[in-house]
Amino acid sequence: IVGGTNSSWGEWPWQVSLQVKLTAQRHLCGGSLIGHQWVLTAAHCFDGLPLQDVWRIYSGILNLSDITKDTPFSQIKEIIIHQNYKVSEGNHDIALIKLQAPLNYTEFQKPICLPSKGDTSTIYTNCWVTGWGFSKEKGEIQNILQKVNIPLVTNEECQKRYQDYKITQRMVCAGYKEGGKDACKGDSGGPLVCKHNGMWRLVGITSWGEGCARREQPGVYTKVAEYMDWILEKTQSSDGKAQMQSPA
């Protein structure tokens, strides 16, 4: 996160760290807890690393440096990448992770509510992006979970800024015209959440951007509302009755 500040314990209890353990262990992506056994993240996090065994998912943590060999983590039972995601494109950058064992909810580990299907009418004015990613383009992973308040940008405006790309209706953009605040490398897959009527909703999944926090180059996020049918279909077909956090 560029231009962000430290988060507090329990402030973003749905945020998880997706880490890979090969010779060493490192944080690669963020994700959002959406049910006892489900994490929503970006499909591109698994490019070149599709093996479930190498992944460790840490939930209910604030500081990555607190992780030791004794820190509990979740393992992956199943990775479900959107069927239309292609490595050669930037579309449908969404994936579900089914955990091997369900998580108990606590003050520091609980799910984020999902938006309503095709939610286009809600005007979100209080949106935040969180993650342990770089704090500048050529930076490094941060120890303490960072947060930053970023306004949403219309798709029309976003398309103007990214003429070489196709900004689809299944994407949502956020950023300041002057730059300075944005997601960055390592924040991929993490949440863009917005507070509406006193409730936090998962509006976007951190996907891509041209550099980080550059002027007139907003961050691009997978629009979760556009994938509600897919999320429900996959979570319900996998375990019969899904326990998802949908808005009231």
Partner: antibody, heavy 125, light 108 residues
Framework: EVQLLESGGGLVQPGGSLRLSCAAS????????MTWVRQAPGKGLEWVSY????????IYADSVKGRFTISRDNSKNTLYLQMNSLRAEDTAVYYC??????????????????WGQGTLVTVSS | DIQMTQSPGTLSLSPGERATLSCRTS???????LAWYQQTPGQAPRLLIY???SRATGIPDRFSGTGYGTDFTLTISRLEPEDYGTYYC?????????FGQGTRVEIK
């Protein structure tokens, strides 16, 4: 299966014009940036131009700027290169290629993942 | 413009040998925008490596790419008869997109 098929090459006199076409199939053409690359006989590869998915944004190499125009018709899945004021140094095999733009570590990637077989343009009197 | 300099110009090696091809750029190039292509006589170029180190679909694992910033390398661990040809590096980090002049790998 992704396929790109160029046509329209041939022999043309200096100062003349030619229009190359590239018919695309096997993928959603309107989602991809497309490009032209050329190769003079016995020489290396030279990038010529690219066009955005919508066709609204185009970029050219200095060597062809003002003389060549890239365009596309997404309804026909076809890419074009209109070449005017041709010179002897424009003699080359012209390839159209698809530009893949995936995502890696929250940044976009860019590479030419599929190429046509090429069409030869000879500029000579 | 970003200049791409490949070395050596020609590499004469026997089948089974290791080939190391270098590509130097005149300015910093984001690894995501660095690719390698193979071209055999009379054929269109074929993508080998993208993002400096990711193998394209169907490319054997004897091909590997490494590098960062201004120094990139393509390695063929054990040359096979079909690997002979010309190899190009290319950047699309900034326009104009540029290719190296190529390295020809020939049979010794």
């Amino acid at each position: 299966e992704v396929q790109l098929l160029e046509s329209g090459g041939g022999l043309v006199q200096p100062g003349g014009s030619l229009r190359l076409s590239c018919a695309a199939s096997g993928f959603t053409f309107s989602h991809y940036l497309m490009t032209w690359v050329r190769q003079a006989p016995g020489k290396g590869l030279e990038w010529v131009s690219y066009i955005s998915p919508s066709g609204g944004h185009t970029i050219y190499a200095d060597s062809v700027k003002g003389r060549f125009t890239i365009s596309r018709d997404n309804s026909k899945n076809t890419l074009y290169l209109q070449m005017n004021s041709l010179r002897a140094e424009d003699t080359a095999v012209y390839y159209c290629a698809r530009v893949a733009r995936g995502i890696a570590a929250r940044s976009r990637t860019s590479y030419l993942d599929f190429w046509g077989q090429g069409t030869l343009v000879t500029v000579s009197s | 413009d970003i200049q791409m300099t490949q070395s050596p110009g020609t590499l004469s090696l026997s089948p089974g040998e290791r080939a190391t091809l270098s590509c130097r750029t005149s300015q910093f190039v984001n690894s995501n925008y660095l690719a390698w292509y193979q071209q055999t006589p009379g054929q269109a170029p074929r993508l080998l490596i993208y993002g400096a180190s990711s193998r394209a679909t169907g490319i054997p694992d004897r091909f590997s790419g490494t590098g960062y910033g201004t120094d990139f390398t393509l390695t063929i661990s054990r040359l096979e008869p079909e690997d002979y040809g010309t190899y190009y590096c290319q950047q699309s980090s900034r326009t104009p997109w540029t290719f190296g002049q190529g390295t020809r790998v020939e049979i010794k």
